[in-house]
């Protein structure tokens, strides 16, 4: 279960110590401090497991470590969604779940994690070195994507550890505005703290709610992870591409492996490292998709109708109005 960040309750300053302005400047740093502390980088983890019973059957599990509300999850294979990857499933917290062959069953495991069972025979079955990617669109973090695959040496029935793999790809820099505001706030906070360090700090009441959910941690890549497999997005393994299926993929025809996006904004910025260690990598910044690329005047490739990303997937009247209506 995710827990939302709690703003510490502030004790009012003793009467006569500060005027109205002083009170405001005292409260503001702590509000900003809370924002800075809770604005941790989200992280996506991916776990791929080959079933021992069926060698052509895979289970992909993905999760989002962040405090935001997930508004859409897209699972793809052959690379990141929108960078040559083929969508296997789309899960919306309220509007439903859709999967495409060879995906058999997609489901939510928790409010912030999903699982997908893949099965196939012959050309449509995934192979051991297939890359699977999960993209989480959340509010307010934006879209975050990570990829994973079975380690080459893994035996059937064993699973790759959860791999929060960094993906250095920015579809839109919309989230930078939010980051900029937070950065400015943090700098301003430090400035205020320095100015007011002679004043006593306000007493904090301990929060009565459960502690913060695990947050993404900054992580210096170890040699092991740096030595992990590096695959450029364009290098898609065509030896196990799916056959042309009557339950077709939401984008592209048989030549899906060549369907690289046409806009530079969607092109890979560098190779993705599929970490083979369970150490959480720094969350991968991808983009914010609020308003479905409305600011950029384009839509992400292969995703379809415009969805407003709502702050709370359980929120009231979550999907009002026609999608993408002009």
């Amino acid at each position: 279960m995710r827990t939302e960040a709690q703003v510490p309750a502030l004790q009012p300053p003793e009467p006569g110590l500060e005027g109205a302005m002083g009170h405001r400047t005292l409260v503001l740093p702590w509000v900003l401090l809370t924002l800075c502390v809770t604005a941790g980088t989200p992280e996506v983890w991916v776990q791929v497991r080959m079933e021992a019973t069926e060698l052509s059957s895979f289970t992909i599990r993905c999760g989002f470590l962040g405090s935001g509300s997930i508004s859409l999850v897209t699972v793809s294979w052959g690379g990141p969604n929108g960078a040559g990857g083929t969508t296997l499933a789309v899960l919306h917290p309220e509007r439903g779940i859709r999967q495409w062959a060879p995906a058999r069953q997609a489901r939510w495991e928790t409010q912030s994690s999903i699982s997908l069972i893949l099965e196939g025979s012959g050309a449509s079955s995934p192979c051991a070195n297939t890359t699977f990617c999960c993209k989480f669109a959340s509010f307010p973090e934006g879209s975050w994507e990570a990829c994973g695959s079975l380690p080459p040496s893994s035996d059937p029935g064993l699973s790759a550890p959860p791999t929060p793999a960094p993906i250095l790809r920015a579809d839109l820099a919309g989230i930078l505005g939010v980051s900029g505001v937070l950065l400015f706030g943090c700098v301003y906070l430090l400035h205020l703290l320095r100015r007011h360090k002679h004043r006593p700090a306000p007493r904090l009441q301990p929060s009565r709610t459960s502690p913060q959910a695990p947050r993404a941690r900054a992580w210096a890549p170890s040699q092991a992870s740096q030595a992990a497999l590096h695959v450029p997005y364009a290098t898609i393994n065509t030896s196990c591409r799916p056959a042309t299926l009557d339950t077709a993929h939401p984008h592209g025809g048989p030549s899906w492996w060549a369907s690289l996006p046409t806009h530079a904004a969607h092109r890979p910025q560098g190779p993705a490292a599929w970490a083979s260690t369970p150490i959480p990598a720094r969350g991968s910044f991808v983009s914010v998709e609020n308003g479905l690329y409305a600011q950029a005047g384009e839509r992400p490739p292969h995703t379809g109708p415009g969805l407003t990303l709502f702050p709370d997937p359980r929120g009231p009247r979550a999907m009002e109005g026609p999608l993408g209506v002009r």
């Epitope: 789309v90 509007r95 999967q99 592209g252 025809g253 026609p322 999608l323 993408g324």
Partner: antibody, heavy 119, light 107 residues
Framework: EVQLQQSGPELVKPGASVKISCKAS????????MSWVKQSHGKSLEWIGD????????SYNQKFKGKATLTVDKSSSTAYMELRSLTSEDSAVYYC????????????WGQGTSVTVSS | DIQMTQTTSSLSASLGDRVTISCRAS??????LNWYLRKPDGTVKLLIY???RLHSGVPSRFSGSGSGTDYSLTISNLEQEDIATYFC?????????FGGGTKLEIK
């Protein structure tokens, strides 16, 4: 306002084929999959399949494979469903419905096209 | 395929009544249960999705509830325009499947 305008009623002979249309307006055609649903007299609704207007990719209910073919014409924002080798079992009202992401809910429906198969 | 069952095929009620229509899935559908109505003139509309979320423009007298395999649609204050056949549909897996429908009539 979202509108799905379907073609008029059809009276066809057994063994023949029929192609019904669904013209979309009031939204971006490529933003929604187009689903087709069968309503037989006195029976429930049955999902036939859907088509992705971006590229024409289709998904079918196993029951209707070989019976229905779904296509789109992006230039005219129109979806089509062809039914072949018609029998009396195919006599029904057929609906088109626009399905938004993740292409599950049928958000907006056409008025229906009645197909009667009779010799 | 997931089977959807609406045990009541027809229902009579008076205007102003509170009416409840039920629907059962053959397996857990994780609240991905949607309700549609088909009016006597043949028009079909989405009413409720995700068990309880009202689609845009749907009057607040409609409400939905349920979880797991059992779901229900309630009309709190029946109006003449609510006379229709109501269908449930699961949005959990393909193929999309519907219940048999419940025809609501005025007493």
């Amino acid at each position: 306002e979202v509108q799905l305008q379907q073609s008029g009623p059809e009276l066809v002979k057994p063994g023949a084929s029929v192609k019904i249309s669904c013209k979309a307006s009031g939204y971006t055609f490529t933003d929604y999959y187009m689903s087709w649903v069968k309503q037989s007299h006195g029976k429930s609704l049955e999902w036939i399949g859907d088509v992705n207007p971006n590229n024409g990719d289709t998904s079918y209910n196993q029951k209707f494979k070989g019976k229905a073919t779904l296509t789109v014409d992006k230039s005219s924002s129109t979806a089509y469903m062809e039914l072949r080798s018609l029998t009396s079992e195919d006599s029904a009202v057929y609906y088109c419905a626009a399905s938004g992401l993740p292409y599950v809910l049928m958000d907006y429906w056409g008025q229906g096209t009645s197909v009667t198969v009779s010799s | 395929d997931i089977q959807m069952t609406q045990t009541t095929s027809s229902l009579s009620a008076s205007l102003g009544d509170r009416v409840t229509i039920s629907c059962r899935a053959s397996q857990d559908i994780s609240n991905y249960l949607n309700w549609y109505l088909r009016k006597p003139d043949g028009t079909v509309k989405l009413l409720i999705y995700y068990s309880s979320r009202l689609h845009s423009g749907v009057p607040s007298r409609f409400s939905g509830s349920g979880s797991g395999t059992d779901y229900s649609l309630t009309i709190s204050n029946l109006e003449q325009e609510d006379i229709a056949t109501y269908f449930c549909q699961q949005g959990n897996t393909l193929p999309r499947t519907f219940g048999g429908g419940t025809k609501l009539e005025i007493k």
